[in-house]
Amino acid sequence: LQEKIEEIAAKYKHLVVKKCCYDGVRINHDETCEQRAARISVGPRCVKAFTECCVVASQLRANNSHKDLQLGR
């Protein structure tokens, strides 16, 4: 997960945009990425970076969770 996020974040050269990506990676079981992104007011660049990293992180966590379940069987 960390490697993939670092790979995405590396393309954002504006520090705030990069940090928006990292914010998207934080675990939040109560809201979707879309719901969380809707509260961002600093600009579309932040929304885009946040959403991309949030979605990728969510997908990777889901995949890992699925693999763990398979191994558990």
Partner: antibody, heavy 118, light 111 residues
């Protein structure tokens, strides 16, 4: 309407520090980054750094080698730029500006003249 | 750092004529289809004023005689037709990455 109002002119001795303020009004202070630029007499614009007041995130121009510190007071919607170890080459007009959409500077302060002289 | 080179450093234009300023970036300021190049006008004793953002978008209140174009590393600001009040310094600026950088400026004088 959006306004950025800066503190008044300063005259400083070499080796001392200066702290310039930039009071924002007419918008939600925490929604936008505040940048600081400077312009030496007859010269172009030089970017110094910025702060995102909502998170306190900062980034600085490495040319200033740790001499610059940017802070923000959310309670008064004011950003500050402190420059230390002043030398004569720091004589310039210092500007704050709001960055809109993480793309461009749509509002600027009126500028603060800082003169460094012994 | 992205270095922005403006040319010419100065130019004198007659009223009604066209003024063209170029800004060349040391690397592309495009990202996923967007261009992060802006233009500012600065008159003596005043702070810079936003003219054009994202290469070609006029800020509100800016006369239509100002226009911007370009992509990648090469950008142009055009004033057509030039008016007496356009006497000023003009700066390009990139916001793609930190550190934000400005071009060296172009001084436009009206003959």
């Amino acid at each position: 309407q959006v306004q950025l109002v800066q503190s008044g002119a300063e005259v400083k001795k070499p080796g001392s520090s200066v702290k310039v303020s930039c009071k924002a009004s007419g918008y939600t202070f925490t929604d936008h980054i505040i940048h600081w630029m400077r312009q030496a007499p007859g010269q172009g614009l030089e970017w110094m750094g910025y702060i995102y007041p909502r998170e306190g995130w900062t980034n600085y121009n490495e040319n200033f080698k740790g001499r610059v510190t940017i802070t923000a007071d959310k309670s008064t919607s004011t950003a500050y730029m402190e420059l230390s170890s002043l030398r004569s080459e720091d004589t310039a007009v210092y500007y704050c500006a709001r960055e809109r959409n993480l793309e461009y500077f749509d509002y600027w302060g009126q500028g603060t003249t800082v003169t460094v002289s012994s | 750092d992205i270095v922005l080179t403006q040319s010419p450093a100065s130019l004198a234009v007659s009223p009604g004529q066209r003024a063209t300023i170029t800004c060349k970036a040391s690397q592309s300021v495009d990202f996923e289809g967007d261009n992060y190049m802006n233009w500012y006008q600065q008159k003596p004793g005043q702070p810079p004023k936003l003219l054009i953002y994202a290469t070609s978008n006029l800020d509100s209140g800016v006369p239509a005689r100002f226009s911007g174009s370009g992509s990648g590393t090469d950008f142009t600001l055009t004033i057509n037709p030039v008016e007496a009040e356009d006497t000023a310094n003009y700066y390009c600026q990139q916001s793609l990455e930190d550190p934000h950088t400005f071009g060296g400026g172009t001084k436009v004088e009206i003959k």
